[in-house]
């Protein structure tokens, strides 16, 4: 399911329950994300070793991951709402190639893997809602995406590993990075 | 095993300095949030800052300012700038190794001993 | 500014006893909470997360429960090791905040 079902029972027993504000249902939808996220990389963990890997000898791929920094306004210091929010979907649009990736690579966590990526994509809808300076947000070349995927496809198998757990580490750090910002809005 | 030592601690007069450092071994400092809390004697655990794994850090309304939180993932080690001390920053002052699943529910699993700073003329 | 206000500040319980320490948070905070034990000296210990997933090693004997602003840590039975203070922690917004803990509970023997 691309959107989180309601957080207990309680919702189907209560049907005067005041319905979510943009605000809380782009922060549920970040940590129902952020679950699944937490359920692939448990499997792929128990495959391979790469989860002991460091971030130094990982920081070696040619993969040009998504990350937040301190010009882009969403630390506590430096905090800029617009220009924060608008490299939130920057950075969501251009990891949906990885999502993409990402498809064919759970064999028990096939339908975990489709949700994150569905979910990913209604969250995107969510936050341009949001978002008052759309001109500012680029999207990513479909030709070069495609490209790319072609190129993460044709590695051997201790490469796409290594790329799947990159890819999970580096969207779990992005989106709390997202909600820490989200949460100041 | 999994260690957090905690160094630097000592007297120091009002308006001074300190660095504060906590050098972790046994495990990647690089893929844990971090955080420094302090206790004054006889008093209750006050949260200092955070700084998670995208280098941001997070502090305490009374920290911003006067201290500097930093991490250093080639030495294993987390550091503490503390300026323009007064008498009532007085305390232990604890490192701790997080886990976070979603924003600041950072659950501190992992503990060092604590270094005590001392703040009087 | 999220605040946590722990009650009661002081318990004076025997050993068997069933005790129960509230939380309350200034605003909601879903489930992101945590408990943590300290004894005299030492440092603190991580006991529930989650509002109420114990930790690997944590005694059955302690459960968490609550959800929003309203938040409790049980202890079924309690043991002579028990007698400590007990800390809340949120975990929804460290923005423009003072304090993340709550101010303590301390369980003394009766």
């Known amino acids: 399911a691309p959107v989180p079902p309601g957080e207990d029972s309680k919702d189907v027993a209560a049907p005067h329950r005041q319905p979510l504000t943009s605000s809380e249902r782009i922060d549920k939808q970040i940590r129902y994300i952020l679950d699944g996220i937490s359920a692939l990389r448990k499997e792929t963990c128990n495959k391979s070793n790469m989860c002991e890997s460091s971030k130094e000898a990982l920081a070696e791929n040619n993969l040009n991951l998504p990350k937040m920094a301190e010009k882009d306004g969403c630390f506590q210091s430096g905090f800029n709402e617009e220009t924060c929010l608008v490299k939130i979907i920057t950075g969501l649009l251009e990891f949906e190639v990885y999502l993409e990736y990402l498809q064919n690579r759970f064999e028990s966590s096939e339908e975990q893997a489709r949700a994150v990526q569905m979910s990913t994509k209604v969250l995107i809808q969510f936050l341009q809602k949001k978002a008052k300076n759309l001109d500012a947000i680029t999207t990513p070349d479909p030709t070069t995406n495609a490209s790319l995927l072609t190129k993460l496809q044709a590695q051997n198998q201790w490469l796409q590993d290594m790329t799947t757990h990159l890819i999970l580490r580096s969207f779990k750090e992005f989106l709390q990075s997202s909600l820490r910002a989200l949460r100041q809005m | 095993e999994v260690q957090l030592v905690e160094s630097g601690g000592g007297l120091v007069k009002p308006g001074g300095s300190l660095r504060l450092s906590c050098t972790v071994s046994g495990i990647d400092l690089s893929s844990y949030d971090l955080s420094w809390v302090r206790q004054a004697p006889g008093k209750g655990l006050e949260w200092v800052g955070y700084?998670?794994?995208?280098?941001?850090?997070w502090y305490a309304n009374w920290a911003k300012g006067r201290f500097t939180i930093s991490r250093d993932n080639s030495k294993n080690t987390l550091y503490l700038q503390l300026n323009s001390l007064r008498a009532e920053d007085t305390a232990v002052y604890y490192c701790a190794r997080g886990s976070t699943d979603y924003a600041f529910d950072t659950r501190l699993d992992l503990w060092g001993q604590g270094t005590l700073v001392t703040v009087s003329s | 500014d999220i605040q946590l206000t722990q009650s009661p500040s002081f318990l004076s319980a025997s050993v068997g006893d069933r005790v129960t320490i509230t939380c309350r948070a200034s605003?909601?905070?879903?489930?992101?909470l945590s408990w943590y034990q300290q004894k005299p000296g030492k440092a603190p210990k991580l006991l529930i997360y989650?509002?109420?997933t114990r930790t690997s090693g944590v005694p059955s004997r302690f459960s968490g429960s609550g959800s929003g602003t309203e938040f409790t840590l049980t202890i079924s039975s309690l043991q002579p090791e028990d007698f400590a203070t007990y800390y809340c922690?949120?975990?929804?917004?460290?923005?423009?905040?003072?304090?993340?803990f709550g101010g303590g509970t301390k369980v003394e023997i009766k």
């Open positions: 922690q949120q975990g929804y917004n460290s923005n423009d905040v003072d304090n993340v």
């Open positions: 605003q909601s905070i879903s489930n992101e």
């Open positions: 700084i998670y794994t995208d280098s941001s850090t």
């Open positions: 989650r509002a109420s």
